[in-house]
């Protein structure tokens, strides 16, 4: 009471740091700074980050919250979790699409579209890897169809059709005749 | 709007006392801490006093240490600075300003004129 | 007690001149720094706080730099209306102190 010196950081328990004058204890997650502490190891007036907006960790500086990242439409994503006061807009793709990364090092942050995923049954093939972080793995083809080319080619139905050396060993007793 | 009006100021007789209020609107009084700020005529700015949102902290400058004595009523929105044992060197306007350290509004100011 | 050492204490500058004034405190203060400009009769107007941000409100064309000891306000482009005297404050520590102020006055 009545003194001139401001007091150092030692404070009881953790996370108060000096802001100007005092030492403060921070606002949690979720809250920005209003106004700092008005007293030695006081508490700072914190805020609830409004709507569409956040901050994800404790803080002792930010006098306004992040707005939230809107998914990008045109990239065709969607939210995979929406934004909270404490944690951003979680962007990615739908069942069926998976992430194509728009640069090289490719990390959590990085831009990026999302792109269908390949139907291995469309393409008469087996599911090797089903598809999420990377598009879906076809394997080899699907019973009575066999490799030609780049695709899978349906055995022939009836003696007329013509069938080459690899339809003979995938297509089995279809070629007697 | 955020508002700080000073008044009590005026002319006194060395010795004598006075008492000052700044009363604030336009803002939730009870979340800050606020100071007292005089300058002399024709001279700089002086910080001379500073009190805790809730009062319960209050700072003095040396030169009004005992002699001076800052407190508020946030159930008035008011802030206060009594005055005692005046000298001629206690002449300047006096401001009440918002703030824990830096200073975002300020009063216009009361003139507080000690003469025999 | 902190010192606050500004100078000039007044200087003489031409509308559209760059305007800068120093400010040295006799010890770290890290960034607990403001500016502050008053006009003849009226209360000070807070311009910067922690060394370099700008209030609300306040022209792009003031700019305030520094940590430590050293700092320094920029007027990029004097404007008639910015001729008043401007004040520099530490609040790293209590007491709070000011500088001697800077007197601006148009040539």
């Known amino acids: 009471q009545g003194g001139t010196r401001s007091p150092r950081c030692d404070c009881a328990g953790d996370f108060h740091k000096k802001i100007g004058l005092f030492c403060c204890r921070g606002c949690p997650a979720g809250h920005y700074l209003k106004a700092p502490c008005t007293e030695p190891c006081g508490n700072s007036t914190c805020l609830v980050c409004p709507q569409d907006t956040f901050l994800a960790w404790e803080n002792h500086h930010n006098s306004e919250c992040a707005r939230c990242q809107a998914c990008d439409e045109q990239a065709s994503q969607v939210a995979l979790e929406n934004c909270s006061a404490v944690a951003d807009t979680r962007c990615g793709c739908k069942p069926g699409w998976f992430v194509e990364c728009q640069v090289s090092q490719c990390v959590s942050s990085s831009p990026f579209y999302c792109q269908p995923c390949l139907d291995c049954g469309a393409l008469h093939r087996h599911t090797r890897l089903l598809c999420s972080r990377r598009d879906t793995d076809c394997g080899t083809c699907l019973p009575g169809f066999y490799e030609h080319g780049d695709g899978c080619v349906s055995c022939p139905t009836s003696t007329l059709g013509s069938c080459p050396e690899r339809c003979a060993a995938v297509c089995g007793w279809r070629q007697m005749f | 709007e955020v508002q700080l009006v000073e008044s009590g100021g005026g002319s006194v007789q060395p010795g004598g006392s006075l008492r000052l209020s700044c009363a604030a609107s336009?803002?939730?009084?009870?979340?800050?801490?606020m100071s007292w700020v005089r300058q002399a005529p024709g001279k700089g700015l002086e910080w001379i006093s500073y009190?805790?949102?809730?009062?319960?902290?209050?700072y003095y400058a040396d030169s009004v240490k005992g002699q001076f004595t800052i407190s508020r009523d946030n159930a008035k929105n008011s802030l206060y600075l009594q005055m005692n044992s005046l000298r001629a060197e206690d002449t300047a306007v006096y401001y009440c300003?918002?703030?824990?350290?830096?200073?975002?509004?300020w009063g216009q100011g009361t003139l507080v004129t000690v003469s025999s | 007690d902190i010192v606050m050492t500004q100078s000039p204490s007044s200087l003489s500058a031409s509308v559209g001149d760059r305007v800068t004034i120093t400010c040295q405190a006799s010890?770290?203060?890290?960034?607990?720094l403001s500016w502050y400009q008053q006009k003849p009769g009226k209360a000070p107007k807070l311009l910067i706080n922690?060394?370099?941000n700008l209030e609300t409100g306040v022209p792009s064309r003031f700019s305030g730099s520094g940590s430590g000891t050293d700092f320094t306000f920029t007027i990029s482009s004097l404007q008639p209306e910015d001729i008043a005297t401007y004040y520099c404050?530490?609040?790293?520590?209590?007491?709070?102190?000011f500088g001697q102020g800077t007197r601006l006055e148009i040539k």
């Open positions: 300003a918002r703030g824990s350290g830096s200073f975002d509004y």
């Open positions: 336009g803002f939730t009084f009870s979340s800050y801490g």
């Open positions: 009190i805790s949102s809730s009062g319960g902290h209050t």
């Open positions: 010890q770290d203060i890290s960034n607990y």
């Open positions: 922690d060394a370099s």
């Open positions: 404050q530490q609040y790293d520590n209590l007491p709070i102190t």
